[in-house]
C-alpha cells in the first residue's frame, strides 16, 4: 500500500466565488474516497466534480475533486481522504 499525497488549491471562479480543488496522487491501490465537507458534513454529490482515478505512470494513481464556494467561507470546508483504512482531512489554504 502506498498512501496518497493530498494537495488543496484554490482559484478564482467568478465574483465572490472560488473553486477549491483537492488532488490525491501517488497512491496504490486505486480505491480511494475523496470528497469535500462543509461544516464536517459531506457535500451533496451534485455540488462536487470528480476526476477519474488515473494511473500516473509510476504504478500508482491520481484523482481530484473540486467544488465552488463563497470567498470568505474557506474555513468551513475541508477535503476528506480515505485510503486503505487511513484517513485525513485537509483545509483550504488561505
Amino acid at each position: 500500500t502506498v498512501p496518497p499525497m493530498v494537495n488543496v488549491t484554490r482559484s478564482e471562479a467568478s465574483e465572490g466565488n472560488i473553486t477549491v480543488t483537492c488532488r490525491a496522487s501517488g497512491f496504490y491501490p486505486w480505491n480511494i474516497t475523496l470528497s469535500w465537507r462543509q461544516d464536517g458534513v459531506s457535500l451533496s454529490h451534485d455540488t462536487q466534480q470528480w476526476g477519474d482515478v488515473l494511473p500516473d505512470g509510476n504504478g500508482t494513481y491520481q484523482t481530484w475533486v473540486a467544488t465552488r464556494i463563497c470567498q470568505g467561507e474557506e474555513q468551513r470546508f475541508t477535503c476528506y481522504m480515505e485510503h486503505s483504512g487511513n484517513h485525513s482531512t485537509h483545509p483550504v489554504p488561505s
Epitope: 461544516d39 464536517g40 455540488t47 463563497c70
Partner: antibody
Framework: DVQLVESGGGLVQPGGSRKLSCAAS????????IHWVRQAPEKGLEWVAY????????YYADTVKGRFTISRDNPKNTLFLQMTSLRSEDTAMYYC??????????????WGQGTTLTVSS | QIVLTQSPAIMSASLGERVTMTCTAT???????LHWYQQKPGSSPKLWIY???NLASGVPARFSGSGSGTSYSLTIGSMEAEDAATYYC?????????FGTGTKVEIK
Amino acid sequence: DVQLVESGGGLVQPGGSRKLSCAASGFTFSTFGIHWVRQAPEKGLEWVAYISYDSRTIYYADTVKGRFTISRDNPKNTLFLQMTSLRSEDTAMYYCARWAYEGGVNYFDNWGQGTTLTVSS
Amino acid sequence: QIVLTQSPAIMSASLGERVTMTCTATSGVSSSYLHWYQQKPGSSPKLWIYSSSNLASGVPARFSGSGSGTSYSLTIGSMEAEDAATYYCHQFHRSPLTFGTGTKVEIK
C-alpha cells in the same frame, strides 16, 4: 441568548400531512446548519434531516426520505419540516438542533424544547 | 447507512464503580466524526465527548472515550450520582447521519 422554538405539532391521522417550524433567535441563523432530530416516547434519539446554512446540502434519514422535506427561510430566521404520508411510527417529539462549527469540530450545541407530533386515527 | 449499536442497553452501577459502554458501527467511522451525547429525562442532549476521545467543556475528567474504526467506547472511571443518564454515540462520517441505540446508566 440562543433560542430555538419548535411549533406545529399536534394530532394527525395516518396518511396526513403536517408542517413543523423552528423559529431561531439570538444568533445569526443564516450562518448555521440546522438538523431535525426526533425522539419517540420512551425511545432513543433518531436523526431526521439536515440542511446546511446555505441550503446547498440537504440529507434525510432513510425512514423519512421521500416523505419529509426540510427547508429554511434565512431572512425570517425559520426552519421548516414538511411531513407527508405520515405513519404511526412518526409519532415523536421533534427537536431542531443547531450544528455548531468551532475549532474544526462540528456538533449539536443548542436544541429547542421540542414539539410533539402524534399520528393516530 | 451506518448503524450504531450500543451495549449494554441498560446498566446499573454502584457509586465509585468503573463503567464502560460500547458503540459498534456496521462500517468504519473516522474518530473525528464520532461524538457522544448525554441526555437526562426531560432535557435536551448535551455534547459529552467529541471526536471519540475529547471531553466537551465542563465534562468531569472521570469520563474518557476511545476507539477507532467500528468500535468505540465511553468509560466513567468512578461512577457518581450525577452521571445517571442515557448516553448516545453519533456519527456524521457518512450520510445519513445516525445516532446509536443508547445506553441508560442507572444507580444501583
